[in-house]
């Protein structure tokens, strides 16, 4: 019988060593010889590699060697199986060498803390000697605490011209020993090197590094007191794994520091009921090594007028990020607080917030927000201890096509006219900002027509129809990602009008 057709061809270029292709040989009943046929040099050259091993496992791979390997290059690889009964060829496969290059691992030679810089260790390595000069390398650094079994990973790239083969691993636990390993790959390649040998390093010890503090002001209650939800989080750049034992909070009316109230909590938020006047709130976090610096926030009086300076704000998606930009009339304002939460009909439980300094834009990675969800985004200007009037917009991190089309009705059917009306798609089904509606209509057995209108229009009059003719109509709602049709409706124009 003819040999089985070679399947699952896979090739790896072990950089500056060999290009090895392997395949599944199928069930062999008699001795089968394999020949790998290659075109290379962008199709300008071709050659063969023939297996000569007697064991079937070794016969299912073949290697090409320098100098007949160049990178970049495109290859075609085809495997021919031959036995006494004849020859059978595999499918032709296509390979870009840059995509299948595999290098040796880098060598870590030092892992050390940097004096005076907390929660960080610096990893220094030597990149593989055999790595393409013309390609940047990407790296995965994996790390874990000595007594942990689960690795965390961080990916980064190094420019090929970058002499500095170091990486600063931040956001670590203080005073903890870490195990580090590194691997690399040609930027375009799907094949990573093996992991380097592991190396150990330790971070410096420290107290908590600080807090960011924010508030949500709620309407005053009947007794004149006002609920204020205090929110806090570790200061930006604090260790990811920083341990905090608890928080001390104290607050007092701006007019009388003698009326200071103090409380402790282990939670990440706190509801205070304050009087109508302005208050100062301060807090620290603490652990066994000490206290963090004090974070302070002013709560304005109920009747206090907040300043307004944001004139215009817009959101757009660029390079996997949601970007919010605004314009301010106040040049002295250079700190802003951004709040964002999903626009759901219930009370927002997942309020997120973040401050921005020295910029009038804010970006967030798309993957930090739920795709197809509408978010309410508010920007508060902050000047010294004053918080200004927020400017709010709605935005989607990623738009999809609506999950349903508009609910459509036909009204005022005439001889040659009809009014098509439709309802807005429910918020939860829009999956994006509706930018327009398209009305598709077609006479039975006739040519189709369409008309696009902007998203503020919820009805449209069709004219110049044929009398006494059946039509089918459908309305499509579109976001930037595409459109979804509503159900199609049939109607028939009148044969004559009362005015005729």
């Amino acid at each position: 019988a003819l040999p089985a057709k070679p399947e699952n061809i896979s090739c790896v270029y072990y950089y500056r060593k060999n290009l090895t292709c392997t395949w599944s040989p199928g069930k062999e009943t008699s001795y089968t010889q394999y020949t790998v046929k290659r075109t290379y040099a962008f199709g300008e050259k071709h050659d063969n590699c023939t297996t000569n091993s007697s064991t079937s496992e070794n016969r299912a791979s073949c290697s090409f060697f320098l100098p007949r390997i160049t990178i970049p290059d495109n290859y075609t690889i085809e495997v021919e199986a031959e036995n006494g009964d004849g020859v059978i060829k595999s499918h032709m496969t296509y390979w870009r060498l840059e995509n299948i290059a595999k290098t040796e691992p880098p060598k870590i030679f030092r892992v050390k803390p940097v004096l005076g810089i907390k929660r960080m260790i610096q990893i220094e390595w030597i990149k593989p000697e055999l790595a393409p000069v013309s390609s940047d390398l990407k790296y995965t650094l994996r790390f874990r605490t000595v007594n942990s079994t689960s690795w965390m990973e961080v990916n980064f790239a190094k420019n090929r011209k970058d002499k500095n083969q170091t990486y600063n691993l931040t956001g670590l636990q203080p005073f903890t020993e870490y195990v580090i390993a590194l691997r690399c790959a040609v930027k375009e390649s799907k094949f990573w090197s093996d992991w380097s040998q592991e190396k150990m390093g330790m971070t410096e010890e420290e107290a908590p590094c600080g807090l960011e503090l924010w508030r949500v002001l709620k309407p005053a209650e009947a007794d004149g007191r006002r609920p204020v939800r205090l929110l806090w989080k570790k200061a930006r750049g604090a260790p990811v794994l920083e341990k905090t034992l608890g928080y001390n909070i104290w607050y007092y009316p701006e007019s009388n520091t003698n009326l200071t109230e103090t409380m402790n909590t282990t939670n990440q938020q706190l509801e205070l009921h304050l009087g109508g006047e302005s208050f100062w709130v301060s807090m620290i976090s603490y652990n066994s090594l000490g206290k963090s610096p004090v974070a302070t926030l002013r709560i304005p009086a109920i009747q206090e007028k907040s300043f307004q300076c944001i004139e215009v704000m817009q959101a757009c998606v660029a390079e996997d990020q949601l970007v919010v930009k605004w314009q301010s009339s106040a040049l002295d304002v250079n700190t802003w607080m951004i709040e964002w939460f999903p626009d759901v009909d219930s009370e927002p439980t997942t309020l997120s917030w973040e401050s921005v300094s020295q910029a009038t834009n804010w970006t967030i990675q798309q993957d930090k927000l739920k795709p197809f969800w509408c978010y309410n985004i508010s920007v508060y200007p902050m000047l010294h201890d004053k918080v200004g009037e927020p400017y709010s917009i709605q935005a989607y991190a990623k738009e999809g096509v609506p999950s349903e089309g508009p609910e459509t009705k036909v009204e005022n059917i005439g001889v040659k006219t009809v009014t098509i009306t439709w309802k807005e798609i429910p918020k939860s089904e829009r999956k994006g900002i509706i930018c327009n509606y398209t009305i598709f209509y077609q006479a039975e057995g006739g040519k189709g027509f369409s008309k696009t209108v902007n998203s503020s229009i919820l009805q449209y009059g069709l004219e110049s129809l044929k009398r006494k003719t059946s039509y089918i109509v459908q309305v499509m709602a579109s976001t930037s990602a595409g459109g979804t049709n509503g159900t199609s409706i049939n109607f028939k124009t009148l044969s004559f009008s009362v005015f005729e």
Epitope: Y15, R16, K17, N18, A41, E44, K45, F65, L66, P67, R68, I69, T70, I71, P72, D73, E129, L130, P132, V133, S134
Partner: antibody, heavy 121, light 107 residues
Framework: QVQLVQSGAEVKKPGASVKVSCKAS????????MNWVRQAPGQGLEWMGL????????DYNPQFQGRVTITADESTSTAYMELSSLRSEDTAVYYC??????????????WGQGTLVTVSS | DIQMTQSPSSLSASVGDRVTITCQAS??????VAWYQQKPGKAPKLLIY???TEAQGVPSRFSGSGSGTDFTLTISSLQPEDFATYYC?????????FGGGTKVEIK
């Protein structure tokens, strides 16, 4: 930095053999092809052959009719070229030359300083 | 074997001149041509490969062109240090062959 250092000048009688060495440093020896090229006095360049130190694979110029043997010793990062049955027209400077560009096979990027072999009775 | 025919075998030029050296292959070698510069008593130095790619550290006044069988090395503005012998070489496959060389002399 990449360096190729060749052995010193040789004087040989016709019919004898000569073995020229080329010690490589500053790079991974097994990762690059080593070529041998010669140049007779006042003449042009003539490629003799190459070796892939990774697998010992060789490729020779047929014009040398089996007189040339190229070898490599990975442990010392040294390539050797041996030419036998020497005749007076083999008097030349012999160069080892390493390839260097991923996208340029059979190009000679780094050269040794050359070894003068004189064949004279 | 592929023959490489280089011309002229020598030329005289002045500093600042534009110099062109040509090389013809006996068969189609696509873009697999390299150019070398050799000064007396020294090893050759790679200038250009793949017909037009400059080797690392080569001044931009050196450029290569051509494909198929006809190739050119151009020195846009000859400098005093450029007086030397230039060789073309095909790097299509083995055996490698060189052109006979072009000696660039001071006029």
């Amino acid at each position: 930095q990449v360096q190729l250092v060749q052995s010193g000048a040789e004087v040989k009688k016709p019919g004898a053999s000569v073995k020229v060495s080329c010690k490589a440093s500053g790079y991974t020896f097994t990762g690059y092809i080593m070529n041998w090229v010669r140049q007779a006095p006042g003449q042009g360049l003539e490629w003799m052959g190459l070796i892939n130190p990774y697998n010992g694979g060789t490729d020779y110029n047929p014009q040398f009719q089996g007189r040339v043997t190229i070898t490599a010793d990975e442990s010392t990062s040294t390539a050797y070229m041996e030419l036998s049955s020497l005749r007076s027209e083999d008097t030349a400077v012999y160069y080892c030359a390493r390839d260097g560009y991923d996208d340029g096979p059979y190009t000679l990027e780094t050269w040794g300083q050359g070894t003068l072999v004189t064949v004279s009775s | 074997d592929i023959q490489m025919t280089q011309s002229p075998s020598s030329l005289s030029a002045s500093v600042g001149d534009r110099v062109t050296i040509t090389c013809q292959a006996s068969e189609d070698i696509y873009s697999f041509v390299a150019w070398y510069q050799q000064k007396p008593g020294k090893a050759p130095k790679l200038l250009i490969y793949n017909a037009q790619t400059e080797a690392q550290g080569v001044p931009s006044r050196f450029s290569g062109s051509g494909s198929g069988t006809d190739f050119t090395l151009t020195i846009s503005s000859l400098q005093p240090e450029d007086f030397a012998t230039y060789y073309c070489q095909h790097h299509y496959d083995s055996p490698l062959t060189f052109g006979g060389g072009t000696k660039v002399e001071i006029k």
